[in-house]
């Protein structure tokens, strides 16, 4: 099948890195600069991403294949391929419409991307609050006060009255 | 073929005022969304501040009460009005088309100026 396709359509022979030019009675012309072809067969060459602004090349554009680009410092790649750059925050911010915006209380952000998450509930393990949380880090939980038996661990447990999460800010 | 060409920086003195202009050409300007960024050797680049095609406009924490951005449809033009200006906004300012809509984002499809310098000393 290979060879009969070969002999009905001659620009299955172009290899990647070439295209089929239909001008030049379809001999197999080179791709022209900033275009790549990464596979054979090809009747046009694709334009090379060209990584601008936030963008940084990763990895330079070649006859076979096209540019990969990554985000400069303070920004962070999204999306398939890095189509996107998204600007840091610091931990405990998100990225708002507004900016990078604080984590509301009993909210955590751990990483420079993303949004804050609600503190673990430690209660609904049947566990207490080990440390508190902060706008970067979670709440710890510890072993029910049940399991605490005198001498066992010399964590005190938190006052009953205080809430699971609970962090003066 | 987009071009966004910047101009309007210049050397100032801490307290002083620069307007940046960027003329756009080669797409539809109006139903475009536009931002200005800016790159500092330290710091990096740093989202601006940026303007829909309806008017709203979104700045960052930092030039927010001192930076203006508006638009001119008739002229294709968006400018930045940059008042009470600090040594800490010495970079250079580019403009960029602005796809996502989203504060801080950028796509692979934006376009970019040249950049103009801004220098901001005594």
């Known amino acids: 099948f290979e060879r009969t396709r070969s002999l009905q359509d001659p620009c299955s022979n172009c290899p990647a890195g070439t295209f089929c030019d239909n001008n030049r009675n379809q001999i197999c012309s080179p791709c022209p600069p900033n275009s790549f072809s990464s596979a054979g067969g090809q009747r046009t060459c694709d334009i090379c991403r060209q990584c601008k602004g936030v963008f940084r090349t990763r990895k330079e554009c070649s006859s076979t294949s096209n540019a990969e680009c990554d985000c400069t410092p303070g920004f962070h790649c999204l999306g398939a391929g890095c189509s996107m750059c998204e600007q840091d925050c610091k931990q405990g911010q998100e990225l708002t419409k507004k900016g990078c915006k604080d984590c509301c209380f009993g909210t955590f952000n751990d990483q420079k991307r993303g949004i804050c998450r609600p503190w673990t509930n430690c209660s609904l393990d049947g566990k207490s609050v080990l440390v508190n949380g902060t706008k970067e880090r979670d709440v710890v939980c510890g072993p029910s006060p049940a399991d605490l038996s005198p001498g066992a661990s010399s964590v005190t447990p938190p006052a009953p009255a205080r809430e699971p999460g609970h962090s003066p800010q | 073929e987009v071009q966004l060409l910047e101009s309007g920086g210049g050397l100032v003195q801490p307290g002083g005022s620069l307007r940046l202009s960027c003329a756009a050409s080669?797409?539809?300007?109006?139903?475009?969304?536009m931002s200005w960024a800016r790159q500092t050797p330290g710091k990096g680049f740093e989202w601006v501040s940026g303007i829909y095609s309806g008017g709203s406009t979104y700045y960052t924490e930092s030039v927010k009460d001192r930076f203006t951005i508006s638009r001119d449809n008739s002229k294709n033009t968006v400018y930045l009005q940059m008042n009470s200006l600090k040594p800490e906004d010495t970079a250079v300012y580019y403009c960029?088309?602005?796809?996502?809509?989203?504060?801080?984002?950028?796509?692979?499809?934006?376009?970019w100026g040249q950049g103009t310098q801004v220098t901001v000393s005594s």
């Open positions: 960029a088309t602005w796809g996502t809509l989203r504060f801080g984002v950028w796509a692979e499809y934006d376009h």
């Open positions: 080669g797409f539809t300007f109006s139903s475009s969304a």
